[in-house]
């Protein structure tokens, strides 16, 4: 429970204005009415409140809106957004992209990745799906924010908006997110020619299955090592030396540089040494010639 103090008559607040910057914390607590603050939120960001004063204003809004702020207040939070926790934001219902833009601008230059991720999640929930307008807003105001969405939220992305996604927007996407986005990208780009298709699908390949990688290896795509290193380990392991050679083309030499890193290291361990030797790269760690490979995982699965 908060310590209650009475507001001195001369400090009574009838308007949210600049005079409040001279109020001490206790005076703000006693004199600023939360309902008045909410009604005049559009004035708050123009007033140079200290962080301590912003804390009081946040607590006032929490008092008024225990179930989460309404969008009419959220859109005018301004720098007060910097005081919000992911738990606060999780209570919100946001549908307006103007609200999203305003808060993304405020968050720039501040360590607020968790808050921004939660905000974007609330927008997607509020709008029913990650539509083209939302995706455009994210790419314009928060490159990389797409990857802050959970795989569950990304599953609502219609394939039609995949074309608007830029490679840099996917830089921070994890495997589970790419697992969701890749099939959508494959669908979105299915009518493109070979080389054009590869350019478009490349940023999404971290979600590609083995069969699709095998198919790509037949198309002279010359995959760069950076893309190869982002492929799913499970998708790379079944590829033969010949398939990897075809997939990488002239970039195959890069395997030597990456031989100690996954997925290259794990893939090497699965290949016959004599097959690896055909690459002429001096890759070591393959299965010695004459050894029989027993896949015990299959037997375990059956028993």
């Amino acid at each position: 429970d908060v310590e209650r103090t009475t507001c001195p008559p001369e400090k009574e607040v009838h308007e949210i204005d600049e005079s409040l910057i001279f109020y001490k914390k206790r005076e703000l607590e006693a004199c600023v009415d939360a309902a008045l603050l909410a009604a005049q939120m559009d004035r708050v960001d123009a007033i140079p409140f200290t962080y301590e004063q912003l804390d009081v204003l946040k607590h006032k809004l929490d008092e008024l809106y225990p179930q989460g702020y309404p969008e009419s207040v959220i859109r005018h939070l301004g720098h007060l957004f910097l005081k919000m926790s992911p738990e606060d934001i999780r209570k919100w219902n946001v549908t307006s992209l103007e609200t999203l833009k305003a808060l993304l601008k405020v968050s720039k230059g501040h360590e607020m990745s968790a808050q921004v991720a939660t905000l974007i999640d609330r927008v997607v929930v509020g709008r029913g799906q990650l539509d083209k307008d939302t995706a455009d807003t994210l790419t314009a105001f928060c490159p990389g924010c797409l990857c802050s969405l959970s795989p569950e939220r990304l599953s609502s992305v219609p394939p039609s908006i995949i074309g608007a996604v830029r490679p840099q927007d996917l830089d921070t996407c994890g495997p589970r997110q790419l697992d969701v986005l890749y099939p959508k990208a494959r669908l979105a780009f299915q009518n493109m020619s070979g080389s054009e298709y590869f350019v478009k699908i490349r940023p999404f390949l971290g979600g590609a299955p083995t069969e699709d990688l095998k198919a790509l290896s037949q198309q002279n795509v010359s995959m760069d090592l950076a893309t190869f290193m982002k492929l799913r380990r499970e998708a790379v392991l079944p590829l033969s030396v010949a398939e990897v050679q075809k997939l990488l083309g002239p970039h195959v030499e890069g395997l030597k540089v990456e031989e100690q890193h996954s997925p290259v290291r794990d893939w090497i361990l699965k290949q016959r040494q004599d097959d690896l030797d055909t690459l002429g790269l001096g890759l070591q760690g393959g299965i010695p010639n004459g050894y029989l490979i027993l896949d015990l995982s299959v037997r375990e699965a059956l028993s």
């Epitope: 429970d1 908060v2 209650r4 507001c7 009838h14 308007e15 607590e29 006693a30 004199c31 600023v32 009415d33 939360a34 309902a35 008045l36 909410a38 009604a39 005049q40 607590h59 006032k60 008092e63 008024l64 809106y65 225990p66 179930q67 309404p70 009419s72």
Partner: antibody, heavy 119, light 108 residues
Framework: EVQLLESGGGLVQPGGSLRLSCAAS????????MSWVRQAPGKGLEWVSN????????NYADSVKGRFTISRDNNKNTLYLQMNSLRAEDTAVYYC????????????WGQGTLVTVSS | EIVLTQSPGTLSLSPGERATLSCRAS???????LAWYQQKPGQAPRLLIY???SRATGIPDRFSGSGSGTDFTLTISRLEPEDFAVYYC?????????FGQGTKVEIK
């Protein structure tokens, strides 16, 4: 079910005092702004006062400022209106009402208690 | 203080007719902070419309609200016998949270 039950009204002489109570139930009182609204006989509604849930910040109509005091006891789920220096023009039915911050409106009202100031 | 002026003072209509009530504010009021109430004789007021146009729980759809800035309207599309009452608008933008003086809708 939300219920607001006012009590404490009655006949009082000019200059006298009276304390109104409003017992609340059916909602989280500790999270809710509460208000008093009055209605003089045959007249319209007049907003009197309100109080915030946590900080107990108060606001008053100019006509009652300095004479009336709104307060609450969150442990008892009860709202109060202490009325001092009563005047004939304070004669009215006093309603306790819940302010819904999400609607910015008074969404539940009590049935009212009559205060008569007369000599 | 924000003054709300309602018009007309009294509206004489027959059941089935359309009622249009006006509420004018002395200064601009955000629509989020404008509400309408109905009061019948001997009863407490009842919230009808909040946020200028959203119907409160249990309010029939013949009641609708509109407007922004300084001009707001409550419309009853087809008057039912139980709709004859006094209607008040209220603003909660600034203190005091003033009411209009009311419009009485009576049977012609």
């Amino acid at each position: 079910e939300v219920q607001l039950l006012e009590s404490g009204g009655g006949l009082v002489q000019p200059g006298g005092s009276l304390r109104l109570s409003c017992a609340a139930s059916g909602f989280t009182f500790t999270h809710t702004y509460m208000s008093w609204v009055r209605q003089a006989p045959g007249k319209g509604l007049e907003w009197v006062s309100n109080i915030s849930p946590t900080y107990s910040t108060t606001n008053y109509a100019d006509s009652v400022k300095g004479r009336f005091t709104i307060s609450r006891d969150n442990n008892k789920n009860t709202l109060y209106l202490q009325m001092n220096s009563l005047r004939a023009e304070d004669t009215a039915v006093y309603y306790c009402a819940r302010y819904n911050a999400y609607h910015a409106a008074l969404d539940y009202w009590g049935q009212g208690t009559l205060v008569t100031v007369s000599s | 203080e924000i003054v709300l002026t309602q018009s007309p003072g009294t509206l004489s209509l027959s059941p089935g007719e359309r009622a249009t009530l006006s509420c004018r504010a002395s200064q601009s009021v955000s629509s989020s902070y404008l509400a309408w109430y109905q009061q019948k004789p001997g009863q407490a007021p009842r919230l009808l419309i909040y946020g200028a146009s959203s119907r409160a729980t249990g309010i029939p759809d013949r009641f609708s609200g509109s407007g922004s800035g300084t001009d707001f309207t409550l419309t009853i599309s087809r008057l039912e016998p139980e709709d004859f009452a006094v209607y008040y608008c209220q603003q909660a933008l600034g203190y005091p949270h003033t009411f209009g003086q009311g419009t009485k809708v009576e049977i012609k």
